[in-house]
């Protein structure tokens, strides 16, 4: 059968299961004259044989763990044993069977963890190796905690990444571990091959002793700092300490202040660098961060609170250069003339801002001094001795001392004596008739002019007219502005008119003075007027209850989950049909009747969050008017992206032969959200069989170093599998391959003879 089992000499690859006794030939090579026979060389291990007639076979079971690939060469020889064709590469790939059990590298592990360590952050790795192929279930290891001792309230304080063997705290462990209560724990860990999924898997166990140590990385107590300190700066105000020496400390100002008056030294001591001013800012909240030598955060940041304590460094201030009040000439003793309100920038409700008022001078002192008094703490001026007469003294000037506990300020008050308010405002007509307006009349439109007159002294509070709508407009849709020179009132629309809720409104106006009327005079019907507002219907679009609706869900919610809802009402009371617009990713559907929004496809934060769509509310029937609102779906991150290489690493090479062990640095990334601290990847070799030649060591949360363990490498390409684990919840792992070529170099570059230009590495190590 030419083709599958026989044929001419050409490069070929065959796959054979290990552990199987030979049952058939591998291939029958056919010779072309002058070739008469074949020769087999390479990694035969005395297992692979070629017969004179070109029959390639193997004579005993293969062992993948001894050699996973046999690189053979077959040449066609003439009758003199001289090569006339080839040699060509024949690759025998040995397929794995589960013939090796996993074994822990240590029968006992010891580690320590600080209380309150971040959940999911590994503090210890157990490591088992299985000589079987890690690319198959046979070599895929699955770690489990068999038992935790002691187990308090049946709560697990520790968890293990079942792929990497990374041991970390659970959320409960982070919160509850306390060395004072229980300083040590023991875990029994099992490892199974077959990814833990088969009853035929092999297993091993190991013991882990864990010491719990105190965590001193804690937020200090809030600090109080007196403002305007005259002590030499910087002044130490508090401190933070990382659990181990060598941390690099920094402060983060979340508020992005133009002036950030704090610093931290490399001991963790925090300083205020300049005097603070409570009146500029009365409290600061910032963060202390501890980082490793590579600039990666060691833990969560600590919140530092600084409260600025007030001192009395501000005098009282007057509300204006001169405060003007009016008093009618017949006002009674004790009547309030007005209140002088001074200010103090010092802290409210403290002695530093508590003010006293005192009249220090009255001019003129006619008919006598002491006509006025001021309430010491309230600042209210009252008539103290007798009624005043305008023709005798039309104006008084008071100098008032306002003081806090340390400062005094003089404020000036002018009191104008005005005629008695014995005339009421009188409307020029009592009924302004009917006014018909469409409900969509613009806000701000003047719809009516009203006029009343007052015979009291012009340009005083006795003759000034204020118009109020006292009836017929409980919604406050209308307002009246008064022209201070003419006392004309302009009725304006302040809120949209609405046919549906108020088709006809009987409006009543009242005209009144800011000054009280004299005793015995009262407002009567002359001070009231009415008009009827008739609103006509306009077919209006539905109205959403919000301009933007927002909802927040986890990106891994099940399809069909309700993720939010919108509501709109039609002013005419018609039913509403809801629809979506701009659902470019096809993630959502809306219930046409209720406005509830559901997911119809897997959501993905990494594709973009928030996801913005438009919701449309359309009248059912009528003129089918519609309106549009926004729906913003904020997607919360789930650890659903395994780590990967940050860039393309094809083209890595070492010059062959190696004169000394070499190394190269690579970077990992993933697409999940890494808020304050950035990714915290852990790195390990993807297969136990790589450990003789390579080692991988973590540099920081994103970078690692791949190093050779020796210099005896063949001149060929090696594919190094590396496991990268993100330590997330749940932890995800990516297996990536770094192709590394060992090649002859010319001037530091890989040398390839002409005709072999494919895949030339471009990066030398």
């Amino acid at each position: 059968q030419e083709g599958k089992f026989s044929g001419p000499l050409k490069p070929m690859t065959f796959s054979i299961y290990e552990g199987q006794e030979p049952s058939q030939i591998i291939f029958q090579f056919k010779a072309n004259p002058p070739a008469v026979t074949f020769e087999l060389t390479g990694e035969t291990d005395n297992i692979f044989v070629i017969e004179r007639e070109g029959l390639l076979y193997y004579n005993r079971a293969l062992d993948r763990e001894t050699r996973s690939t046999h690189n053979l060469q077959v040449a066609a020889l003439d009758a003199n044993g001289i090569i006339v064709e080839g040699p060509v590469p024949i690759t025998i790939k040995v397929k794995d069977i589960n013939d090796n059990r996993p074994t822990f590298l240590q029968s006992k592990y010891e580690g320590s963890v600080r209380q309150n360590s971040r959940p999911g952050k590994p503090f210890l790795y157990v490591n088992a190796t299985d000589l079987d192929d890690p690319a198959t279930p046979n070599g895929q290891l699955y770690y489990q905690i068999v038992i935790q001792l002691p187990m308090i309230n049946n709560v697990m304080y520790f968890q293990i990444n079942n792929k990497t063997g990374a041991i970390s705290l659970t959320r409960e462990g982070s919160q509850e571990l306390n060395p004072a209560k229980n300083p040590s724990y023991n875990l029994v860990i099992s490892v199974k091959d077959m990814g833990g999924q088969s009853e035929n898997s092999f297993s091993d166990t190991t013991s882990v002793d864990i010491i719990v140590t105190e965590n001193i990385w804690k937020a200090p107590k809030p600090v109080e700092m007196v403002e305007n300190s005259t002590d030499p700066h910087p002044i130490k105000i508090t401190q933070v300490r990382w659990n181990d020496p060598g941390a690099q400390y920094s402060l983060v100002d979340k508020e992005k202040l133009p002036r950030f008056p704090f610093s931290i030294d490399q001991e963790g001591d925090i300083y205020v660098t300049q005097p603070l001013d409570r009146e500029e800012k009365d409290a600061y909240v910032f963060y202390a961060v501890a980082k490793d030598e590579y600039g990666k955060p060691l833990s969560y940041p600590l919140e530092i609170h600084v409260k600025v304590k007030d001192i009395n460094d501000n005098p009282p201030t007057c509300p204006s250069p001169v405060t003007v009040f009016e008093v009618q000439e017949n006002e009674r003793l004790g009547n309030s003339i007005g209140t002088l309100t001074a200010h103090d920038r010092d802290e409210e409700n403290t002695a530093n801002s508590f003010l006293n008022y005192r009249i220090v001078e009255q001019t003129p002192k006619l008919p006598m001094d002491g006509l006025f008094l001021i309430q010491t703490y309230a600042g209210m001026l009252q008539l103290a001795k007798q009624s005043l007469k305008k023709q005798d003294t039309p104006q008084y000037n008071l100098t008032i001392e306002v003081s806090d506990k340390d400062f005094k300020t003089l404020c000036f008050v002018q009191i104008n004596v005005i005629d008695i308010n014995d005339q009421i405002p009188i409307f020029e007509k009592s009924d302004y008739g009917n006014l018909t307006l469409a409900e969509d009349t613009n806000i701000g439109s003047t719809i009516l002019t009203i006029q009343a007159t007052d015979a009291d002294e012009p340009f005083t509070g006795s003759s000034k007219i204020l118009y109020h709508i006292i009836k017929g407009d409980s919604e406050g849709r209308l307002g009246v502005d008064t022209d201070p020179h003419t006392n004309t009132g302009y009725v304006i629309i302040k809120k949209p008119l609405d046919f549906e809720t108020a088709a006809v409104s009987n409006i009543v106006f009242k005209a009144e003075n800011p000054e009280p009327l004299v005793f015995g005079v009262k407002y009567n019907a002359s001070s009231f007027a009415k008009f009827t507002l008739i609103v006509t219907d306009v077919n209006e679009a539905p109205q959403f209850s919000q301009h933007v609706f927002q909802a927040k869900v986890s990106e891994d919610v099940a399809i069909g989950t309700k993720v939010g809802n919108v509501t709109a009402k039609d002013p005419e009371g018609l039913d509403i049909s809801y629809s979506l617009r701009g659902d470019t990713r096809g993630w959502l559907k809306i219930d046409h009747v209720t406005g509830e929004i559901f997911s119809v496809a897997p959501l993905d934060r990494e594709a973009g969050s928030p996801y913005r769509v438009q919701v449309v509310a359309t009248e059912v029937g009528g003129s089918s008017l519609s309106s549009v609102s926004e729906f913003h779906l904020i997607l919360m991150d789930v650890n659903d992206n395994p780590p990967r290489l940050a860039k393309d690493y094809t083209g890595l090479f070492f010059c062959h032969p190696l004169s000394a062990p070499g190394s190269l640095i690579f970077e990992a990334t993933d697409d999940d959200q890494h808020l304050f601290r950035g990714p915290h990847f852990t790195f390990s070799l993807g297969s136990g069989s790589l450990q003789n030649d390579w080692e991988v060591s973590k540099i920081n949360g994103t970078h690692a170093r791949l190093s050779t363990r020796h210099t005896e490498f063949e001149e060929r390409e090696y594919v190094v599998l590396i496991r990268i684990n993100d330590g997330g919840r749940p932890p995800l792992e990516g297996i990536v391959s770094l192709p590394v070529t060992f090649c002859s170099c010319v001037e530091g570059s890989c040398f390839r003879p002409a005709g072999h230009q494919t895949g030339i590495p471009t990066v030398g190590m």
Epitope: P34, V36, A79, N80, G81, I82
Partner: antibody
Framework: QVQLQQSDAELVKPGASVKISCKVS????????IHWMKQRPDQGLDWIGY????????QYNENFKAKSTLTADKSSSTAYMQLNSLTSEDSAVYFC????????????????WGQGTSVTVSS | DIVMTQSQTFMSTTVGDRVSITCKAS??????LAWYQQKPRQSPKLLIY???NRFTGVPDRFTGSGSGTDFTLTISNMRSEDLADYVC?????????FGSGTKLEIR
């Protein structure tokens, strides 16, 4: 023991042909190749070509392709070389020799030689 | 074709001497090289194959070395019966080619 017995010396006229024989004994003719060499007085050896009697495969030196024809007769365990269109340049001693290699061996080289056949081309 | 050069056509020697005869190939032949001894009016005899392997029955005073393009035949303790022509041959590729020979003479 292995022996290669060549035919006797030949005196031939220019333009004529000659066929030299090489009879082997002590082994099977089809197991090894037979090579032919030319040696002129006080000169080095020139390789003419070989024949593999088992499959009648031949390979020639380009310089002798037109001049020589190699054959073998398995029944008589004899190899032959015919030289045609002879000129004085063809006057030389011609050797046959067995190539030592066979499948499974690591020996190479011409391990057994005939005694040589002198060919003289003269009018 | 691969040219085999034996630069010393003649070499004078004395019984008991150590003699080294060289052969240079015009291109890499690996170890596909044989040495032959030819005495006057006799056929050549195979001494060395694969550059360094002694053929059956060859005395151990004959040693071959080298690979690639440069090869040496050494006679460690010259005897009178060793006076002969020594010829190298490559069998890396066709056509097979011989060196011109080096003749050993008594000084």
């Amino acid at each position: 023991q292995v022996q290669l017995q060549q035919s006797d010396a030949e005196l031939v006229k220019p333009g004529a042909s000659v066929k030299i024989s090489c009879k082997v004994s002590g082994y099977t003719l089809t197991d090894h190749t037979i090579h032919w060499m030319k040696q002129r007085p006080d000169q080095g050896l020139d390789w003419i070509g070989y024949i593999y009697p088992r499959d009648d495969i031949t390979q020639y030196n380009e310089n002798f392709k037109a001049k020589s024809t190699l054959t073998a007769d398995k029944s008589s365990s004899t190899a032959y070389m015919q030289l045609n269109s002879l000129t004085s340049e063809d006057s030389a001693v011609y050797f046959c020799a067995r190539w030592s290699w066979h499948f499974g061996s690591n020996y190479y080289g011409l391990d057994y030689w005939g005694q040589g056949t002198s060919v003289t081309v003269s009018s | 074709d691969i040219v085999m050069t034996q630069s010393q056509t003649f070499m004078s020697t004395t019984v008991g001497d150590r003699v080294s005869i060289t052969c240079k190939a015009s291109q890499n032949v690996g170890t596909a090289l044989a040495w032959y001894q030819q005495k006057p009016r006799q056929s050549p005899k195979l001494l060395i194959y694969s550059a360094s392997n002694r053929f059956t029955g060859v005395p151990d005073r004959f040693t071959g070395s080298g690979s690639g393009t440069d090869f040496t035949l050494t006679i460690s303790n010259m005897r009178s019966e060793d006076l002969a022509d020594y010829v190298c041959q490559q069998y890396s590729t066709y056509p097979l080619t011989f060196g011109s020979g080096t003749k050993l003479e008594i000084r």
